[in-house]
Amino acid sequence: CKAMHVAQPAVVLASSRGIASFVCEYASPGKATEVRVTVLRQADSQVTEVCAATYMMGNELTFLDDSICTGTSSGNQVNLTIQGLRAMDTGLYICKVELMYPPPYYLGIGNGTQIYVIDPEPCPDSDF
């Protein structure tokens, strides 16, 4: 089978600081030297790009400076962290992996991770 399988956790709960981390693992059918990882958010039938990074195998993946994502890579595994999340960002986050080089190109799409974000309660004013 030429398809690339991508695995990611079904559910993740963001921290009280709005940070969510999950692992995206892919079974590579080819010997890729360049890999692109994209986090997509699916709401209803709309899919939008959250962040994307391209990395050379053996090197670290680097997101743009203004990205809300950070990550590290190890072999066929990528550890992704999304920051700055609020309750309204609760939703399905899909890990998309593309083997960009050398040809042939392969596409792998995970089933998505449902990230739940709960806004922290504001601290009550204290009298002392």
Epitope: K2, P103, Y105
Partner: antibody
Framework: QVQLVESGGGVVQPGGSLRLSCAAS????????MHWVRQAPGKGLEWVTV????????HYADSVKGRFTISRDNSKNTLYLQMNSLRAEDTAVYYC???????????WGQGTLVTVSS | EIVLTQSPGTLSLSPGERATLSCRAS???????LAWYQQKPGQAPRLLIY???SRATGIPDRFSGSGSGTDFTLTISRLEPEDFAVYYC?????????FGPGTKVDIK
Amino acid sequence: QVQLVESGGGVVQPGGSLRLSCAASGFTFSSYGMHWVRQAPGKGLEWVTVMWYDGSNKHYADSVKGRFTISRDNSKNTLYLQMNSLRAEDTAVYYCVRGELLGYFDNWGQGTLVTVSS
Amino acid sequence: EIVLTQSPGTLSLSPGERATLSCRASQSVSSSYLAWYQQKPGQAPRLLIYGASSRATGIPDRFSGSGSGTDFTLTISRLEPEDFAVYYCQQYGTSPFTFGPGTKVDIK
């Protein structure tokens, strides 16, 4: 809304060259892989080539490898196809196509006809 | 490359009838990466189904897709006059991205 408008088609002699353009609007061009798909008269669809995102990676069908070159200008939201050493079998309607974020081909231009004939 | 074969080549049916179109792959294709397109004369193809079974935006529910591995099916439950067209399957999981040769659905 997403719009793809091809231009540059026409009649060219065998061995000649032609450059097709595709003007894109209504979406963040640099976030999408952009493809060319062609259709010979009365025939089926044939994928030709793709250029990904920032333009650093591209892939071609064997039938056009070494003769066609895909490129893109993300600042102008434009995709190009430079076709050299054209053959009669390259005669087709050429479609500019957006690869959706999940991979499928969700938006197609109206197509531009390329005729290779002496 | 993955070769897609479609059958039948032509399907002659009447409005209101059920149409069943088949797409077979030369090797296993993940259902995540199988699409169906409709094309009418003089028009560009239009996406109907992606991921083997998900309907694209604005596609009526009389169109449905199913299948896995090497065998996929597009079903039109009750043909409307505007459904008479050519239908193509496509795999988009690996390059070269390939299309089937098409099935023409025409009026009996």
